[in-house]
Interface confidence: low
């Protein structure tokens, strides 16, 4: 059980107040984290509160401003990047968001040696992506879907690609589906470790069907947004990987990296690129039917100036029970011999663990094991491997950082974080300096987040980087809800849940229950993290009990739970939410007549199906930006879990798992359907089809659209959204305003 700070003395009780919706919408109780921008083994940059860029040296204890806020302000810079030779800084301004990760911006180069902006051969605008080489101060950037190279910031650019074309050919940046569902980055180019080579992807979207939607804006006629967007079963982008020598870029030009034969024989994806040395690169490929992944290690052949990927350096990862990997196929972390690597994949018992691959995957040495999962490999040095897992005390929703000494044989394991601030901190991530000389730990909860700096050799804490003192003080007079994380054992399935309880919770009373669900494959909602959000307010002020349940299909508890939903989305996720609700009712403090469910995106899909399950458990519910049919969603994501919508594959379940097919069942619930009209991700089409089916079935429902808003419903829409949902729930639960 995680008990949030609460006070029991009556004298203090009077000064305490509940959270308000305004607190949440204003972000009054938001927290800060501190991630050092490492520039060496012992130095990092940080943007101070007054916007100076400050360099800190841990070993000397000194700090100095390398770039003043005045310089930042002169170009309205919101971001910066120091060149590795420390001679230049790029300043980023005019940020303009595109999709989840992508944005365009204007870039200025500031010369630190003379304190002036570089004049002559200035960068064009707006730029889609820009980065320094890992050594020196070469620049690579993407402009109008083509890649350019500068040897020095003031030099004229060398154009690497010429075929870039809006919505057709993308060089060095991903198209929509690769950005959202495969790479999870705004870039698709990678410098080799010393900046000798530049690798990049080319995505050809020429034959991809286009999603078109209106953007209303302020003009007389709306604009039409067109995005090449492959839905399930549609034509996919064609990807090619090239590498160019940046020292003599015109000499032989870009060289294509060959695709493994077993991958190239049918539709495939490129999933990631990892440089090993300047002359060795590792590419990962994936069949369109995403249960076979191939890791290919390629070497530069000086004599031919080409890249050779011998079959002996191909490593196949295959899943027989689901799809390859977790959400994505994991990436390798190479060791110092530049050929062997560490990688997370399922062991024989179906738990994701770290394996060491020296020659073949079959001969992999398992490094971690147990009925828990290794989640991320942060760093491998000569003598240590740092990783995170949810092993400690068998709580899947925790994250602790471990060190395995690989320099000595056999390895020994140490939990770096388990006992540091045990009550406050159970969910960590980490950020390492070069050679892991130092590292920052960022604790996300369950208590108030705290960021600390540590010695990479001894793990000693050196200093607190951010402890959110102001937040701690602000919360002193707030009646926060209580939170508990527990599990239900049902039919050999473990359902972990988080319950958020009103501050004066009394087990003998009856409370309305709100289920908050996401439930997507490889997701996790029950986590030991701090949050003061909308559901905190609903518990604190409105006296609701809120529960989050991780059912089948969710992550970090083994493949049996994860892959249970393979090829049948929309079945077990819903069943498990319903099962949990029945168990909560049995606990005795839930008012059975006042139970609601809500979710966003995949959660909107699950909440809709739960409402239409015909159980009579739910009085009302909300779906925000829901998927309504898997035929409407992106190929890369959907097919990973569902296969293809073809007669000889899985069309039947595609058809059976739609929200529309259950329109009739919404008759006995109050349903609020919400969607942004400019949602590039889960298209408005999804809600339009639900609404049409409900109208055709003559079922009453409530709806709200947000004009020109995307999947995030940000800005003023957020305030309107949560106010609207609050009114809906209070009305459903007969709570006075």
């Amino acid at each position: 059980i995680v008990l949030r700070p609460s006070r029991v003395h009556n004298s203090e009780e009077n000064t305490m107040r509940a959270l308000t919706l305004k607190d949440i919408l204003n972000g009054t109780f938001s927290y800060k984290t501190f991630f050092p921008n490492w520039i060496s083994g012992q130095e990092y940059l940080h943007q101070s509160a007054d916007n100076n860029i400050v360099l800190y040296n841990i070993e000397t204890g000194q700090s100095y401003t390398i770039l003043s806020n005045r310089t930042m302000k002169s170009v309205n810079a919101s971001n910066y990047g120091l060149s590795p030779d420390r001679q230049f800084v790029y300043l980023e301004s005019d940020y303009s968001k595109l999709w989840r990760y992508s944005y365009t911006a204007t870039y200025y180069i500031y010369d630190l040696s003379n304190g002036e902006f570089v004049r002559g051969n200035e960068l064009p605008r707006p730029i889609q992506y820009l980065c320094w080489s890992p050594v020196g101060s070469k620049l690579a950037y993407v402009y109008q879907n083509n890649i350019y190279l500068k040897q020095r910031p003031g030099d004229p650019p060398f154009q690497i690609t010429f075929n870039g074309r809006e919505n057709k050919i993308f060089n060095g940046i991903p198209d929509w589906v690769y950005e959202e569902e495969m790479l999870a980055t705004k870039y698709a180019l990678w410098w080799s470790p010393n900046g000798k080579f530049l690798a990049y992807a080319e995505f050809n979207d020429t034959d991809i069907p286009v999603i078109a939607y209106s953007y209303y804006g302020d003009e007389q006629y709306p604009r039409t947004i067109n995005i090449p967007y492959p839905k399930a079963g549609a034509k996919n982008p064609v990807v090619r990987i090239f590498i160019i020598d940046t020292t003599y870029p015109a000499y032989v030009g870009p060289q294509e990296v060959p695709v493994p034969a077993m991958i190239a024989s049918s539709d495939y994806y490129f999933s990631w690129l990892t440089w090993v040395t300047d002359e060795r690169v590792c590419l990962q490929w994936l069949k369109r039917v995403q249960n076979v992944s191939v890791l290919s290690i390629c070497d530069f052949r000086e004599d031919w100036q080409t890249w050779d990927c011998p079959k002996t350096q191909e490593h196949i990862e295959e899943s027989r029970t689901g799809w390859a990997g977790g959400f994505f196929v994991s990436t390798p972390v190479f060791s110092y011999d530049a050929i062997s690597y560490y990688k997370i994949f399922s062991d024989k018992d179906g738990y994701k663990h770290i394996h060491y691959i020296k020659d073949t995957v079959e001969n992999a040495i398992q490094i971690t094991s147990g009925k828990w999962e290794a989640i991320n490999i942060f760093r491998v040095t000569q003598d240590s491997l740092f990783y995170s897992s949810n092993e400690f005390e068998e709580y899947p929703g925790r994250r602790n950082i471990y060190r395995i000494s690989i320099g000595s044989y056999p390895p020994s394991k140490k939990c770096v974080t388990c006992h540091l601030r045990k009550e406050r901190c159970q969910y960590y991530t980490a950020s390492f300096s070069d050679y892991a000389k130092y590292y920052a730990l960022v604790c996300y909860g369950p208590g108030i987040p705290i960021s600390t700096l540590h010695d990479g050799r001894t793990d000693q804490e050196i200093k607190i980087l951010e402890e959110n003192k102001e937040l701690e003080n602000a919360l002193k007079n707030i009646q926060l809800p209580k939170e508990e994380i527990k599990k239900l054992e049902v039919d050999e399935i473990t359902l972990w849940y988080k319950m958020i309880l009103p501050p004066q919770f009394d087990r003998s009373k009856k409370y309305p229950l709100l289920i908050q669900v996401y439930g997507g494959p490889c997701s996790q909602s029950v986590r030991s993290v701090f949050a003061v959000n909308w559901i905190s307010y609903l518990a604190s002020k409105e006296g609701m009990v809120i529960a989050l349940v991780d059912g089948r299909g969710t992550a970090f508890q083994g493949d049996k739970l994860l892959y249970a939903v393979y090829r049948k989305l929309g079945v077990y996720e819903v069943e498990d939410q319903i099962t949990a609700v029945r168990k909560f009712i049995e606990m005795g403090f839930i008012d059975e007549k006042r139970i609601a469910i809500w979710g966003w995106s995949y959660g909107g899909y699950v909440s809709s199906l739960a409402l239409a399950s015909g159980t009579g458990l739910f009085k009302c519910g909300i779906a925000v930006a829901p998927v309504s049919s898997w035929e409407y969603y992106a190929s890369v994501y959907t097919e990973r879990f569902m296969g293809l919508p073809t007669k000889d594959d899985n069309l039947e379940h595609y058809k059976n798992s739609t929200v529309m097919a259950r329109a009739e069942y919404f008759r006995n619930v109050d349903y609020l359907l919400i969607h942004g009209t400019a949602d590039d991700n889960v298209h408005f089409q999804n809600s339009a089809q639900i609404a049409k089916a409900l109208v055709n079935a003559q079922v009453d429902f409530q709806a709200m659209w947000y004009s020109d808003q995307n999947h995030g419903l940000s800005g003023l829409s957020t305030n309107h959204l949560y106010t609207h949902m609050t009114h809906f729930l209070k009305q459903c639960f007969s709570l006075s305003d």
Partner: nanobody, 123 residues
């Protein structure tokens, strides 16, 4: 569940040889990391030698090449060939099995244990 049974212990002279066996029953023997630990009264169990499913081996530094660990997956048996035995090799020798991979020196990382067999080296 795996049951482990050691055999082959006994009283020998310094400089002699001895071969310990560990017979396993139960689940697939081949997938376990197997190890030999020893313990003298009042001291912690220490890992003497271990072998992975992929036949990678580990030996304690103090052994100086005198011991050899091996396994026969077809017979579900692990062996420890001990040559040039010394007085300080006197101990109770335990056979241990660990699910999953990776050789660990800590006894807490092993899931299954035998009852132990006494090895006594006299002068």
């Amino acid at each position: 569940q795996v049951q482990l049974q050691e055999s082959g212990g006994g009283l020998v002279q310094a400089g002699d040889s001895l071969r310990l066996s560990c017979a396993a029953s139960g689940r697939t023997f081949s997938s376990y990391v197997m190890g030999w630990f020893r313990q003298v009264p009042g001291k912690q169990r220490e890992l003497v030698a271990a072998i992975t499913s992929g036949l990678s081996t580990y030996y304690a530094d103090s052994l100086k090449g005198r011991f050899t660990i091996s396994r026969d997956n077809a017979k579900n048996t692990m062996y420890l060939q001990m040559n040039s035995l010394k007085l300080e090799d006197t101990a109770v020798y335990y056979c241990a099995a660990r699910e999953g991979g990776g050789i660990w020196t800590s006894s807490t990382q092993y899931d299954y244990w035998g009852q132990g067999t006494q090895v006594t080296v006299s002068s």
